[in-house]
């Protein structure tokens, strides 16, 4: 049916909008669009005739109408009087005439708003402060951002007057943020510039930072205040009672035992006139200097080599650390440290032994770090990986193959067609391909640093029609109630219609069974016995119907709780005792009895030759199948009287 | 049971155009392409091209493009071969067939065929 | 386009004997089809893939072959036998058949 998109549909003044036609009629004679619902010749915008390729004006026709030879039209510089419906009038070579209406909307473009406040100085805990977005703007809708976040929920914000006034009432010092309004239309969103709330409060308590109060000789110290304030507060440093500097910052470089003593530092706010301040006791001990690390192989080769990383510097009677990223150093094989601790080698290295690895000196007080060292570990290239995974491709589509294989330093790549060298590219591209274009496709990656190269091959055909498929299972022998298997229908070939049968039926309804990827794969979750069938797919495409050979699927099961026969449990003195024990099973189980908790023989038949009452007892058959790993076991009691003394007793056997 | 039914035997002058149909029972035509062959008297068979009757998608012999129009109305289940500006030697028998694989084994199916004679 | 030779074109054959029909391709085919016409009736699909016997079809019939050669052999005609048989590809468009052999019961 012929139908009309508008793209946009929503259009803003001064753009352009596309008229889009889809599902076009062929063998046209010609078509013309009409502003509104009908076909009107006052309004007529433009015709067109396909025969001599004309455009023809209409009295609707304002100069900013184009008409595309696929009847499409495209209105520019659009104005708020376009907005409506438009209707395309097309008449068939056979003068059937066929109409379609399509219309859009025209919404002016907003100005960028801003924000007025009726109070810039509010104070904590005291003031209410009003913010309005500006101007006001009908057809719109007013959103506000603190800090770019939706407005928070809280009794202390309040939306009035359409959402255009936000009030903050009784502001804390955590009303402090960035507010933006925006205002919204169908064609556009504007946001205005932030206006920073100032809560003038403080100063708090100030606080001292780092708050560790042991340094190193040598070191260099560096303190910093702060205290909550607005206007931020003036700071000023006293050691020891002697004024220092009237500043946020203390830095003293490599300090000494000298320097220990008490740091005070006083806040003062120059609006509310108050002061606060902080002690901090400062003690300065003689320390080592801070560790790194060297290594003796800077760009290790996996599996190949080993490296040797080692703190410095050497100093007796330190204790030294180790971590791998971040964490203490895991147990294995490959990791060693030396008797002092000092070098940790990591023997045949691979792409997870990245690090990062810091050393650690310990000492009375801290552990110095040493700055982290990664290792630059070259591996690979790992066997590449070619996608898409199709193997059929039918003639006239595009051929697009990507390599890839995990290297460091990543991989060069090669591709060859039949042995001979395309290109050195990651992606093939092959454009309308033909038969002739079947072939082997080989991606090659190569580490320059390594010198190491790995191939893929693929066999690509290049056929309409399909080859015979085959079933690929996950599972060859999956345990009854416990597994599922996955089979997949080969090969993977695009525009192909993959079907499945069990013993030649299609397939049951059944939540067990589960069709995925499209319906290439068929899933049977937690199989039964009743699962082992014989399982065709078959395929088929515009030119091709083929199935694949029958796969039957081999179920584990039992064993189930064993029978022993024959079911008689009184026997006569002097009888053969000849039990049978038997239990489903696949495979077929082991079987072993005990008479009494007694281990007997591994045999499925019990036999017993003229027993006596001695023989009386719990006789207990027990299967096991190894392959489910499961057993499982029956206890039977056989009673046996002395001959003659009661009737309707087996004579055995 | 599937069956393609066809329409009956045409008789047409050069340059006219025919119109051969083809309805299908027994199975969803949505489901398989449709293919056209056509078989000379006295003489083989020849492949015109195929529709894919549930998206209009249609494949032809080269020596067809541009005189061959598949087309398929799936509501009642009909495809349909439309051959212009006919000449003397597309005087021929035209046969429906699809290819389908609705059992565990492909099968071939195809209408009675139609004949159609070109002549002046 | 893969043009399919067959050969013969003609074969007259007694009852029970073997009979071979050969169909060349001009390049490379995955598969190779058989159909089997008789007069005034429509194709049947005879074996398909090169050497699957369509639904039907006596077990007398077998198809083989790889590449550009094939064949499709009757092992012991028998006087139903007798029809005209097209081998057909499907690997390129387009599509093409054998001219066809016509079998005779003498």
């Known amino acids: 049916k012929l139908t009309i998109e508008s793209t946009p549909f929503n259009v803003a003044e001064g753009k352009e909008v596309l008229l889009l036609v889809h599902n076009l009629p062929q063998h046209l004679f010609g078509y013309s669009w009409y502003k509104g619902e009908r076909v009107d010749g006052n309004r007529q915008i433009i015709g067109y005739v396909i025969g001599t390729q004309q455009a023809t004006p209409g009295p609707a026709y304002s100069g900013r109408e184009i008409i595309y030879p696929n009847a499409s039209l495209l209105i520019q510089n659009i104005i708020q009087n376009d907005t409506g419906f438009y209707t395309l009038h097309v008449i068939k070579s056979d003068l059937v005439n066929e109409e379609a209406t399509g219309q859009f909307r025209v919404y002016p473009e907003l100005p960028k708003p801003s924000i007025s406040s009726n109070n810039s100085k509010p104070v904590e805990d005291k003031d209410a402060v009003a913010f309005t977005c500006e101007p006001e703007t009908q057809d719109a809708t007013y959103l506000w951002w603190v800090n770019n976040q939706s407005l928070p929920v809280s009794p202390r914000l309040q939306l009035s007057n359409g959402n255009r006034t936000l009030t903050l009432f009784n502001v804390t010092r955590n009303d402090t943020a960035s507010y933006k309004c925006e205002t919204q239309n169908p064609v556009s969103a504007r946001r205005s510039d932030s206006v920073i709330l100032n809560v003038l409060y403080g100063p708090d308590a100030p606080t001292i930072s780092p708050l560790n109060t042991s340094y190193r000789s040598g070191e260099n110290l560096n303190l910093s205040c702060h205290a909550a304030s607005n206007p931020p507060a003036q700071y000023s440093w006293f050691v020891n009672g002697t004024f220092q500097q009237s500043t946020q910052e203390l830095f003293i470089p490599n300090i000494t035992v000298n320097n220990s003593g008490s740091y005070t530092c006083q806040a003062h706010n120059s609006d509310t006139g108050l002061n606060r301040t902080t002690v901090t006791t400062i003690t300065v001990y003689a320390e080592p200097p801070k560790p790194f690390i060297t290594s003796n192989n800077s760009n290790p080769v996996e599996d190949e080599d080993a490296v040797a990383l080692t703190c410095e510097p050497e100093i007796q009677n330190t204790t030294y650390l180790w971590w791998v990223n971040n964490q203490s150093l895991p147990v294995s094989p490959r990791l060693q440290l030396s008797n002092d601790n000092r070098t940790l080698t990591l023997l045949s290295v691979t792409r997870n032994d990245v690090g990062p690895y810091e050393c650690g000196i310990q000492n009375e007080l801290s552990v110095d770090h040493s700055d982290p060292v990664i290792l630059n570990v070259l591996y690979g290239p790992d066997d590449p990986t070619i996608s898409p995974s199709y193997t059929y491709y039918r003639p006239g589509v595009n051929l697009s193959l990507s390599c890839h294989a995990a290297s460091n330093p990543p991989a060069q790549y090669s591709w060859l067609i039949d042995g001979n060298i395309q290109q050195h590219t990651q992606e093939l591209f092959i454009s309308n391909i033909t038969e002739k274009n079947s072939g082997l496709y080989t991606c090659q990656a190569n580490n320059s640093a390594s010198g190491h190269s790995r191939t893929t091959v693929k066999t690509i055909t290049v056929s309409a029609e399909l080859p015979k498929p085959s079933i690929s299972s996950n599972n060859s022998k999956p345990v009854e109630d416990k597994d599922a298997v996955a089979f997949t229908c080969e090969p993977e070939a695009q525009n192909t219609t993959y079907l499945w049968w069990v013993n030649g039926q299609s397939l049951p309804v059944s939540p067990r069974l589960q069709l995925s990827n499209g319906n290439r794969t068929l899933t049977l979750f937690n199989v039964t016995r009743n699962d082992a069938r014989a399982y065709v797919c078959g395929i088929q495409n515009s030119v091709s119907a083929n199935r694949s050979d029958p796969v039957t699927l081999d179920v584990l099961y039992g064993p189930d709780t064993p029978i022993i026969s024959p079911p008689d449990s009184s026997y006569l003195s002097g009888a053969n005792l000849n039990l049978s024990c038997h239990s489903a099973s696949n495979p077929s189980p082991q079987y072993s009895w005990r008479i009494n908790g007694i281990p007997q023989q591994h045999t499925q038949v019990l036999f017993i030759a003229k027993i006596t009452p001695n023989n009386n007892g719990t006789y207990a058959c027990f299967v096991s199948n190894l392959a489910t790993g499961r057993n499982n076991s029956i206890v039977k009691s056989i009673t046996v009287s002395a001959s003659g003394t009661s009737p309707g007793l087996s004579a055995g056997a | 049971q599937v069956q393609l039914v066809q329409s009956g035997a045409e008789v047409k002058k050069p340059g006219a155009s025919v119109k051969v149909s083809c309805k299908a029972s027994?199975?969803?035509?949505?489901?398989?392409?449709m293919h056209w062959v056509r078989q000379a008297p006295g003489q083989g068979l020849e492949w015109i091209g195929w529709?894919?009757?549930?998206?209009?998608?249609?494949e032809y012999d080269p020596k067809f493009q541009g005189r061959a129009t598949m087309t398929a109305d799936t509501s009642i289940s009909t495809a349909y071969m439309e051959l212009s500006r006919l000449r003397s030697d597309d005087t021929a028998v035209y046969y429906c067939?699809?290819?389908?694989?609705?059992?565990?084994?492909?099968?071939?199916?195809w209408g009675q065929g139609t004949l159609v004679t070109v002549s002046s | 386009e893969i043009v399919l030779t067959q050969s013969p074109d003609f074969q007259s054959v007694t009852p029970k004997e073997k009979v071979t029909i050969t169909c060349s391709a001009s390049t490379s085919v995955i598969y190779m089809h058989w159909f089997q016409q008789k007069p005034d009736q429509s194709p049947k699909l005879w074996i398909y893939?090169?050497?699957n016997l369509a639904s039907g079809v006596p077990s007398r019939f077998s198809g083989s072959g790889s590449g550009t050669d094939y064949t499709l052999t009757i092992n012991s005609l028998e006087a139903e036998d007798a029809a005209t048989y097209y081998c057909q590809q499907r690997s390129s468009y387009p599509l093409t058949f054998g001219q066809g052999t016509k079998l005779e019961i003498k």
């Open positions: 067939n699809i290819i389908t694989m609705a059992t565990p084994y492909p099968m071939d199916y």
């Open positions: 529709i894919d009757p549930e998206n209009g998608d249609t």
């Open positions: 893939s090169t050497s």
């Open positions: 027994g199975f969803n035509i949505k489901d398989n392409y």
